[in-house]
């Protein structure tokens, strides 16, 4: 046959040679010819490639800079990045994790949805009625109203999304 | 198109030693392909002797080892063969190859 | 070393013959990736080799297709499929997989 046009599953064609490609973990030092293999060498220590590959240079792993509040959650390996999570109370900006922000709180009449992650930012949610928040937080859920009956008590002051019901005792002259 | 030209040869004395060269042109000897030496006795077949790598390492013939030496000057883009203690039996063309291309060859005659 | 014998040793023939050399390897010539080094070249009274087949069975730039190689492990050929005048030369197998690279004894193709 006259050399070939396409290639298999890792390799690749270069000079009408169907060459193979470097592992992940290695990169390419120099391309097969008629009568040599594909020569691949070992990435560095901080390198990496993650797929089978003819890069003639590795990737730097992700570096986890603590003054942007990063911090290493997965060290890398010649066939992975390192990946970065933030320091407690912190969260990332993107799906890359370039940078942290302080986690948001919820404000007085919202409370805590979801608490955050090293990767998403709080989620909060209006007190719904009979329910409230007096508090800016990271963490409070939105607290019940408290149940004047059950202490056989009774609503003296209306309950609002920032302030519990205020109790007290009923009145001795009704019948 | 990649061209090699050989020099050096000739008329050797026993236990002398000989310098071939190859200049090659049409394509870095340091950009890939290995580099080899092959010779040819007079009326006989093919031997390989060894190659010079484009990243300047080598390989022998075991049989050849302890007497021959591939080297390089990348500047003149040219490979060398250095062979030592000659006998009657290393007569020959010497050739040199990236083996799709090859020399015009040189004749090596060791005789007193 | 992976010993190469190619057979026949010489062999007469007519133009339009269809013409097969072989060559076998005393060691598996597949390497891990695969992949086989196996070539063949051409080689006519005083003139250096010509590559004509390269990696079992891939025809070099510029060989006509009358010229074909197969096999695998250790054992090929070269198929000429109708001989021409000017194929009457001898032919070389060639292993590049292991060091020391080897070469057959050589197939002389004579005109009958």
């Known amino acids: 046959p006259e050399p070939p046009t396409a290639c298999r599953e890792k390799q690749y064609l270069i000079n009408s040679q169907c060459c193979s490609l470097c592992q992940p973990g290695q990169k390419l030092v120099s391309d097969c010819t008629e009568f040599t293999e594909t020569e691949c060498l070992p990435c560095g220590e901080s390198e990496f490639l993650d797929t089978w590959n003819r890069e003639t240079h590795c990737h730097q792993h992700k570096y986890c800079d603590p003054n942007l509040g990063l911090r290493v959650q997965q060290k890398g390996t010649s066939e992975t990045d390192t990946i970065c999570t933030c320091e407690e109370g912190w969260h990332c900006t993107s799906e890359a994790c370039e940078s942290c922000v302080l986690h948001r709180s919820c404000s007085p009449g919202f409370g805590v949805k979801q608490i955050a992650t090293g990767v998403s930012d709080t989620i909060c949610e209006p007190c719904p009625v009979g329910f409230f928040s007096n508090v800016s937080s990271a963490f409070e859920k939105c607290h019940p109203w408290t149940s004047c009956e059950t202490k056989d008590l009774v609503v003296q002051q209306a309950g609002t999304n920032k302030t519990d019901v205020v109790c007290g005792p009923q009145d001795r002259l009704r019948a | 198109e990649v061209q090699l030209v050989e020099s050096g040869g000739g008329l050797v004395q026993p236990g002398g030693s000989l310098r071939l060269s190859c200049a090659a042109s049409?394509?870095?000897?340091?950009?890939?392909?290995?580099w080899n030496w092959v010779r040819q006795a007079p009326g006989k077949g093919l031997e390989w002797m060894g190659y010079i790598r484009y990243d300047g390492s080598n390989n022998y013939n075991p049989s050849l080892k302890n007497r021959i030496t591939i080297s390089r000057d990348t500047s003149k883009n040219t490979f060398y063969l250095q062979m030592n203690s000659l006998r009657a039996e290393d007569t020959a063309v010497y050739y040199c190859a990236r083996l799709d291309y090859w020399g015009q060859g040189t004749l090596v005659t060791v005789s007193s | 070393d992976a010993q190469m014998t190619q057979s026949p040793s010489s062999l007469s023939a007519s133009v339009g013959d269809r013409v097969t050399i072989t060559c076998r390897s005393s060691q598996s010539l597949e390497n891990t990736n695969g992949n086989t080094f196996l070539n063949w070249f051409q080689q006519k009274p005083g003139k250096a080799p010509k590559l004509l087949i390269y990696r079992v069975s891939n025809r070099f730039s510029g060989v006509p297709s009358r010229f074909s190689g197969s096999g695998s492990g250790t054992d090929f050929t070269l198929t000429i499929s109708s001989l021409q005048p000017e194929d009457f030369a001898t032919y070389y197998c060639?292993?590049?997989?292991?060091?020391?690279?080897?070469f057959g004894q050589g197939t002389k193709l004579e005109i009958k």
């Open positions: 049409g394509y870095s000897i340091t950009s890939n392909y290995y």
């Open positions: 060639l292993q590049v997989t292991h060091v020391p690279f080897t």
